[in-house]
């Protein structure tokens, strides 16, 4: 503990200027005081001043009032500091002395004489209020007051409680009169070292290092740290707990990066095509006729449907097509003929019938042939007659199915596993291979099962020029060439503009 016993001298009266021994002072009693403070004694005895002692300079002559003085010599009130717990009781001896010597340091002068002394014994609590007293004897009177106060940073009824106000890392407080800590605004805890976080700051998710702050723990955000942060990789999602990725409407996948409404958000399908939110890329485009490509961005060739008739060649134009007709034909699709039945325009055994009083004609085609001049062989593969992945082939007036290993039959409808079933026709030799039976055929036969009789194919020698398509007719030596754009002639051998010098049927 630590405190100060303060004694305020107010007035000393010695009207006759007398000493304690009855003698008078010449020319007057030059008065100074000695104060001795010690522990409580029922009977005051000589001995050490256990609580402290102090002397004053000369304060006056005979009778005088003592003014308060805060510094230098003659300080009043007098200060008697102590460094222990104040016990609450004391003994005080105040002596008035006359000195013939130095005013400032009378203690050191020889020949000092006692004028009077008083002794006070009793209890005294620590406090700021002065206790006032007056002592008289036959010759003198002393008015004074005293108190005990605690030194700076010491508090309590015995000045035993140390409290030093601070505002740093170790605490933020002032001191109450009893020495207890009074936290500065925004701080709490035994030593006022815990900040009071922003009001509403989440107790678990948030913390603070200074008042009115709310710092979020990992995974939380917001003013009060009550809102989570989604996963690092999350793209179009939210969370209800940290690092979650709950997808926004229209998004899917672990990180909500798959667009479930790609069609709506991006409109990838072009040219009036239909978009579906499905498929490996999250969408599929269904094209309108005449368009193709992943996004239906590619226009199909307008010539793809072979609109030009009678050997006319087709050329694509921006939004249409144009037919270049061979000699003897005209019209948008070369559908009109300048020929008559006299020109024998019907191929493949077609019968010619006069029309419009002989100014035009119409061909009646035999089975398996079509076209305005019976020039096209009917494609019997259009109905996909071959089962089990068999490949359909047009062969003269009929068609055959080329079966995958392990299958046979006219339509590849029969499943075979080995040569035990004698799959090879016309005396073919069967070989049992890993992918199914293979037939080695005798002369005059071909096909996977030796089922095809080899006949002469008029198109086999490639009689058509300039990339024309060859069609065989009813007789083995008959063929028709379908010319590409820019060429005419029975073998498509003439560029447009040159007269043909050969008949149409070779």
């Amino acid at each position: 503990g630590s405190g100060i016993f303060q004694l305020r001298l107010q007035e000393f009266v010695n009207q006759r200027g007398m000493l304690a021994n009855g003698q008078s002072c010449e020319p007057g009693c030059r008065t100074f005081f000695r104060i001795c403070l010690k522990h409580f004694q029922a009977t005051f005895s000589e001995g050490p001043c256990t609580f402290g002692n102090v002397s004053t300079p000369v304060l006056g002559t005979n009778s005088f009032v003592v003014r308060d003085k805060n510094s230098g010599s003659g300080r009043n009130p007098l200060q008697l500091p102590f460094n222990f717990t104040w016990p609450g009781t004391f003994s005080l001896n105040i002596q008035a002395w006359h000195t013939p010597g130095d005013d400032l340091r009378p203690e050191t002068s020889p020949g000092n004489s006692l004028i009077s002394q008083i002794i006070i014994q009793g209890s005294l609590a620590v406090g700021k209020i002065w206790r006032t007293d007056e002592q008289n004897d036959t010759l003198t009177r002393l008015s004074y007051s005293y108190r005990v106060i605690c030194s700076d940073n010491y508090y309590g009824e015995s000045c035993s409680r140390l409290c030093k106000k601070r505002d740093d890392h170790f605490g933020h407080y002032e001191c109450q009169p009893d020495g207890s800590l009074s936290c500065l605004p925004g701080w709490t805890g035994k030593y006022c070292d815990q900040p009071i976080c922003l009001s509403g700051c989440h107790e678990q998710n948030g913390y603070c290092s200074k008042p009115d702050e709310c710092i979020c723990r990992p995974g939380w955000q917001g003013r009060l740290c009550n809102e989570c942060i989604p996963h690092n990789g999350c793209r179009h999602g939210t969370c209800s707990i940290p690092w979650q990725c709950a997808c926004d409407e229209g998004w899917g996948g672990l990180f909500c990066d798959q667009d479930l409404n790609y069609c709506t958000h991006h409109s990838p399908c072009k040219n009036g095509s239909t978009c579906s939110n499905s498929g490996p890329k999250g969408y599929t485009c269904t094209c309108l006729p005449g368009y193709t490509g992943e996004h239906c961005e590619l226009g199909l060739s307008k010539c793809a449907s072979n609109p030009c008739r009678n050997g006319g060649s087709c050329k694509d134009q921006e939004n249409s097509y144009h037919c270049l007709c061979p000699p003897g034909y005209y019209g948008q699709h070369c559908e009109h003929s300048t020929l008559t039945c006299a020109d024998s325009p019907c191929f493949n055994g077609g019968s010619c019938r006069e029309r419009n009083q002989g100014s035009s004609y119409a061909c009646e085609c035999p089975p398996n042939f079509t076209g305005s001049n019976c020039e096209k062989k009917v494609d019997r593969c259009t109905s996909n007659p071959c089962a089990n992945g068999g490949q359909c082939q047009n062969r003269g007036p009929s068609r055959t199915c080329r079966c995958r290993p392990g299958f046979t039959g006219t339509h590849c409808e029969l499943h075979i596993s080995d040569c035990a079933r004698s799959p090879c026709a016309h005396g073919g030799t069967c070989h049992d291979l890993e992918n199914g039976p293979v037939c080695t055929c005798p002369a005059g036969f071909s096909g996977r099962r030796c089922e095809v009789r080899i006949t002469h194919d008029a198109c086999a020698s490639g009689p058509c020029f300039n990339g024309a398509t060859c069609y065989t007719g009813l007789s083995p030596n008959n063929f028709v060439c379908n010319c590409p754009y820019g060429f005419v002639g029975s073998r498509c051998e003439f560029p447009v503009g040159l007269p043909p010098s050969f008949p149409w049927v070779a």
Partner: antibody, heavy 118, light 107 residues
Framework: EVQLVESGGGLVQPGGSLRLSCAAS????????MAWVRQAPGKGLEWVAT????????YYRDSVKGRFTISRDNAKNSLYLQMNSLRAEDTAVYYC???????????WGQGTLVTVSS | EIVMTQSPATLSVSPGERATLSCRAS??????LAWYQQKPGQSPRLLIF???NLADGVPARFSGSGSGTESTLTISSLQSEDFAVYFC?????????FGQGTKLEIK
Amino acid sequence: EVQLVESGGGLVQPGGSLRLSCAASGFTFSNFPMAWVRQAPGKGLEWVATISSSDGTTYYRDSVKGRFTISRDNAKNSLYLQMNSLRAEDTAVYYCARGYYNSPFAYWGQGTLVTVSS
Amino acid sequence: EIVMTQSPATLSVSPGERATLSCRASEDIYSNLAWYQQKPGQSPRLLIFDTNNLADGVPARFSGSGSGTESTLTISSLQSEDFAVYFCQQYNNYPPTFGQGTKLEIK
């Protein structure tokens, strides 16, 4: 694909101001907290400021407090950094990044250079 | 604030070999640590978060480990594209702080 594109950098005198912008795409911007991180030439990375996704709460490193302001416009998918009273020590490449002060910075922009010099 | 110290400042390793980079925090960061890769003229790229979780699209040759104050980034078999500067970052305490970086160069 997540993309963050910064703009607004340039040369400015000490005491001057600049406003940086960051355009975000490829993710739902309003769902995520955002930040600015800077890198002085030839030096390491330094967090500058953060803004929450929900209520726009902001945090700043001590050296820029009172001078810099981070903000966002969720309708425009944009993040901003208003820089006032610029000092020479603010010279750096400023990166826009997705993240908070208490989470990793998952995505970064290409950066914009701010040079403070007289 | 927490101080992050990376070592070594420069590491020379041959392609195909193993590289080990270290990061130390001045106090416990409870696994709240990330690693970034930065190539010259480019922005940083997140490699690892929460000490040992691989970020999306990062090759499996990268791995992270550690606890408390010590963390390690390991690249099992170095590829030519792995030579860059690597930064660690703690996000456990406010403010977030980065290490000064380790430059990984070809030996």
